[in-house]
């Protein structure tokens, strides 16, 4: 079987605009270096949200200005996306690439629909 990437179908961001989901992959080989990319698909446009390469057993390291954080455990990656607003609602797709050792393998999940609801502004108090 080809490498399978699983992720939840739907996630609701919390009131602070943070959404978390698990991206799990069935590995056809013993990878020591894995690249995880989060892609956002909305209105048939696909954009890269964030990406991280990690060594198995080590933490994921996203760029300093990334809106993503994450941890890994075996073939499972726990991803958190922060700073989301209602306009960021969309399908967030997890792409996993086994970078080392060769051969390279790629797997793409079906996507997690993340719903973001902007909080109501607090009424002014006298």
């Amino acid at each position: 079987k080809a490498m399978h990437v699983a992720q939840p179908a739907v996630v609701l961001a919390n009131s602070r605009g943070t959404a978390s989901f698990v991206c799990e992959y069935a590995s056809p080989g013993k990878a020591t270096e894995v690249r995880v990319t989060v892609l956002r698909q909305a209105d048939s446009q696909v954009t890269e949200v964030c990406a991280a390469t990690y060594m198995m057993g080590n933490e994921l390291t996203f760029l300093d200005d990334s809106i993503c954080t994450g941890t890994s455990s075996g073939n499972q990656v726990n991803l958190t996306i922060q700073g989301l607003r209602a306009m960021d609602t969309g399908l967030y797709i997890c792409k996993v690439e086994l970078m080392y050792p060769p051969p390279y393998y790629m797997g793409i999940g079906n996507g997690t629909q993340i719903y973001v609801i902007d909080p109501e502004p607090c009424p002014d108090s006298d």
Epitope: A2, E48, M106, I108
Partner: antibody
């Protein structure tokens, strides 16, 4: 417009070396995975090598491992293929190609026009 | 390595015909299969990616289907400019192998 232009091809004797270049324009070269693909006269397409955007990860087809080296200079928007210990069976048109579709992985959406390499004594 | 096979290796057809080309992978590649068109002396052109997604600018008479090991490229109504050689390619694992090609010529 988005363009890839190969250069550096020519006639070379067996055992000699040659370096191909591929100049990219019209897109942010440093963000894309790049490949070399070749086609022997009258034959089909053969993938040769790939290099990731940061230049750290590279893979090759078995027949060129240890003889060919793929590299890139993101500051010059240029992809390279250093070919050494050339053999007659390396004779082909060499194309550089871009992986430009995130959800397709390594599908080649932009191709250069190709440069011909002939290995002959 | 994943081997790719195509059938037929060549076919003759007339303008307006419906043409179907099949591609088979030696192991499951999910939907990581792409189709290219190549005309003599020219670089290949991407038609279909991820088995069934039409590349921007490609006419809608081209369509792709399949997953796992068996894939199909269909040209619903062959046009004069479609006479060319068609290649499938897997992008699941290195080496990113191509099929041997299918040449479509005029009957």
């Amino acid at each position: 417009q988005v363009q890839l232009v190969e250069s550096g091809g020519g006639v070379v004797q067996p055992g000699r070396s040659l370096r191909l270049s591929c100049a990219a324009s019209g897109f942010t070269f440093s963000s894309y995975v790049m490949h070399w693909v070749r086609q022997a006269p009258g034959k089909g397409l053969e993938w040769v090598a790939v290099i990731w955007s940061d230049g750290r990860n590279k893979y090759y087809t078995d027949s060129v491992k240890g003889r060919f080296t793929i590299s890139r200079d993101n500051s010059k928007n240029t992809l390279y293929l250093q070919m050494s210990s050339l053999r007659a069976e390396d004779t082909a048109v060499y194309y550089c190609a871009r992986s430009g579709i995130a959800l397709a992985g390594n599908a080649f959406d932009i191709w250069g026009q190709g440069t011909m390499v002939t290995v002959s004594s | 390595d994943i081997q790719m096979t195509q059938s037929p290796s060549s076919l003759s057809a007339s303008v307006g015909d419906r043409v179907t080309i099949t591609c088979r992978a030696s192991q499951s590649i999910s939907s990581y299969l792409n189709w290219y068109q190549q005309k003599p002396g020219k670089a290949p052109k991407l038609l279909i990616y991820a088995a069934s997604s039409l590349q921007s600018g490609v006419p809608s008479r081209f369509s792709g289907s399949g997953s796992g090991t068996d894939f199909t490229l269909t040209i619903s109504s062959l046009q004069p400019e479609d006479f060319a050689t068609y290649y499938c390619q897997q992008s699941y694992s290195t080496p990113f192998t191509f099929g041997p090609g299918t040449k479509v010529d005029i009957k």
